[in-house]
């Protein structure tokens, strides 16, 4: 008996071939001997089966001795043994129809779980293997689960169902909803304008939700909400903003925040959360602000940084085009009685200068 695998919702063509290459009488029946379709001369006739409105054949092939049964919009319950009667012969074809669906929605938040459920006909024992867009393979039976979805899991998942050494392939498009970056750091000199950007890693037709930026300043004992906003069809509207600092927010995506001035009291870490309509859970992006200040008070030249810096970072004070006068892996350095000239305060790591502030020391007369 020939086995054919079909996909729910698809169209399948079951073949039946006569030895004579001409149009002769044929019938297709199901396992209950109920007629599905056949012919009367050059006319297609249909029986009382449940497939009535979804069954068809190809009249153009009859003259060649081919009498296919075409079933459209396949259903799991179409799984059956189909019998083609032609020239006093019976050709049996076993059709097995499978369906593969994602648990709820195909748009899932980063960190959530994806469950794929296989619908299969009674008595079948298929195995399923799915390959994610980033090449991750998962195997299972009736259900497959992937916990902790990552951004790289966005895209087309290809799943192969194996039964009776035959296979059928499903493609499911999954969109992982996340920000492009989990974390970012902005380095600014005191007084500079600060731009925070929160680009999303996905595009959807309509995007609606609400968000908030909580900020933990290094100098503060507790965190506070800096801004709350709504998102409606990709349009951003501010609901509430603190008086200090007075953040400004862009009206369009990507989410964009402007802090008019970088000040030591603002240095710290923030967490932007975005709750999307009809989704449980929130998207998160961490943002960090490091602020540098160089000052001269009487005979003391000081450079300080505030904010979440790596302990490997080096803070240096140097006179332009000269060796560093002082370098420390600390958050403040100073020089007593600095000589006149342009001094540079540098915050650097193993690969680059991250932040630089210049201060002019005038000669003392």
């Amino acid at each position: 008996k020939k086995v054919v695998l079909g996909k729910k919702g698809d169209t399948v063509e079951l073949t039946c071939t006569a030895s004579q290459k001409k149009s002769i009488q044929f019938h297709w029946k199901n396992s209950n001997q109920i007629k599905i379709l056949g012919n009367q001369g050059s006319f297609l006739t249909k029986g009382p089966s449940k497939l009535n409105d979804r069954a068809d054949s190809r009249r153009s092939l009859w003259d060649q001795g081919n009498f296919p049964l075409i079933i459209k919009n396949l259903k799991i319950e179409d799984s059956d043994t189909y019998i083609c009667e032609v020239e006093d012969q019976k050709e049996e074809v076993q059709l097995l129809v499978f369906g593969l669906t994602a648990n709820s929605d195909t748009h899932l938040l980063q960190g959530q779980s994806l469950t794929l459920t296989l619908e299969s006909p009674p008595g079948s024992s298929p195995s399923v293997q799915c390959r994610s867009p980033r090449g991750k393979n998962i195997q299972g039976g009736k259900t497959l689960s992937v916990s902790q979805l990552e951004l790289q899991d966005s895209g087309t998942w290809t799943c192969t169902v194996l039964q009776n050494q035959k296979k059928v392939e499903f493609k499911i498009d999954i969109v992982v909803l996340a920000f492009q970056k989990a974390s970012s750091i902005v380095y600014k000199k005191e007084g500079e304008q600060v731009e925070f950007s929160f680009p999303l890693a996905f595009t959807v037709e309509k995007l609606t939700g609400s968000g908030e930026l909580w900020w933990q300043a290094e100098r503060a004992s507790s965190s506070k909400s800096w801004i709350t906003f709504d998102l409606k069809n990709k349009e951003v509207s501010v609901k509430r903003v603190t008086q200090d600092p007075k953040l400004q927010m862009g009206k369009k995506l990507p989410l964009h925040l402007t802090l008019p001035q970088a000040l030591p009291q603002y240095a710290g870490s923030g967490n932007l959360t975005l709750a999307l309509e009809a989704k449980t859970g929130k998207l998160h992006q961490e943002v960090n602000l490091v602020v540098m200040r160089a000052t001269q008070l009487q005979k003391n030249l000081t450079c300080e940084v505030w904010g979440p810096t790596s302990p490997k970072l080096m803070l240096s004070l140097k006179l332009e085009n000269k060796e560093a006068k002082v370098s420390k892996r600390e958050k403040a350095v100073w020089v007593l009685n600095p000589e006149a000239g342009m001094w540079q305060c540098l915050l650097s790591d193993s690969g680059q200068v991250l932040l630089e502030s210049n201060i002019k020391v005038l000669p003392t007369w």
Epitope: V290, P311, K312, M314, L347, S348, D349, S350, G351, Q352
Partner: antibody, heavy 122, light 107 residues
Framework: QVQLVESGGGVVQPGRALRLSCAAS????????MHWVRQAPGKGLEWVAI????????YYADSVKGRFTISRDNSKNTLYLQMNSLRAEDTAVYYC???????????????WGKGTTVTVSS | DIQMTQSPSSLSASVGDRVTITCRAS??????LGWYQQKPGKAPKLLIY???NLQSGVPSRFSGSGSGTDFTLTISSLQPEDFATYYC?????????FGQGTKLEIK
């Protein structure tokens, strides 16, 4: 392509000195911190030293502090490790590696040389 | 200096198994941890940096998690080419320190 090639290894007596070199190609050498990492026969990896992109800062493992000196010549795209007062326990394969530093937040050694073998034996 | 304790020191597993290796720091290193794979006679290869970031070209069956003092490397479904020695490295502060390694062998 991006490549690091170590040289200068060999057999040396305890108390003597040796200088290892690491020739870099395929990238802007002067924009990266560089490391030396070693591995004694049959043992695990041991971090030895780092030098910053401009040579301004150098840090060492306690086991080599005061005996080894890391240096670089950015005009020659070359990293060095001067090893003085060598001991039997310095016997190892010495690897040089490039450090990527992003945003002062993400750090990793993404490119490694194949290693050069140093044997300290009398 | 920061000490890194890796466990287990050796591990036997089969192709297709899910494997977890842990690394513990003697003090808070935030997320300053990387994972490296080494095969006999070869240089180490970077797998994961800054706790959970997959290095370009590394198969997605490798993943990292943790923060503070406790970190994990997970291989979701072992492949024949994954049998090697794995090291964690704290790059949070100088001097950098490696864990003692975990040798992953075929069962």
């Amino acid at each position: 392509q991006v490549q690091l090639v170590e040289s200068g290894g060999g057999v040396v007596q305890p108390g003597r000195a040796l200088r290892l070199s690491c020739a870099a190609s395929g990238f802007t050498f002067s924009s990266y911190g560089m490391h030396w990492v070693r591995q004694a026969p049959g043992k695990g990896l041991e971090w030895v030293a780092i030098i910053w992109y401009d040579g301004s800062n150098k840090y060492y493992a306690d086991s080599v502090k005061g005996r080894f000196t890391i240096s670089r010549d950015n005009s020659k795209n070359t990293l060095y490790l001067q090893m003085n007062s060598l001991r039997a326990e310095d016997t190892a394969v010495y690897y040089c590696a490039r450090e990527v530093a992003l945003e002062g937040y993400y750090y990793y050694m993404d490119v490694w040389g194949k290693g050069t073998t140093v044997t300290v034996s009398s | 200096d920061i000490q890194m304790t890796q466990s287990p020191s050796s591990l036997s597993a089969s192709v297709g198994d899910r494997v977890t290796i842990t690394c513990r720091a003697s003090q808070d290193i935030r997320n300053g941890l990387g994972w490296y794979q080494q095969k006999p006679g070869k240089a180490p290869k970077l797998l994961i940096y800054t706790t959970s970031n997959l290095q370009s070209g590394v198969p997605s069956r490798f993943s990292g998690s943790g923060s503070g003092t406790d970190f994990t490397l997970t291989i979701s479904s072992l492949q024949p080419e994954d049998f090697a020695t794995y090291y964690c490295l704290q790059d949070y502060n100088y001097p950098y320190t490696f864990g003692q390694g975990t040798k992953l062998e075929i069962k």
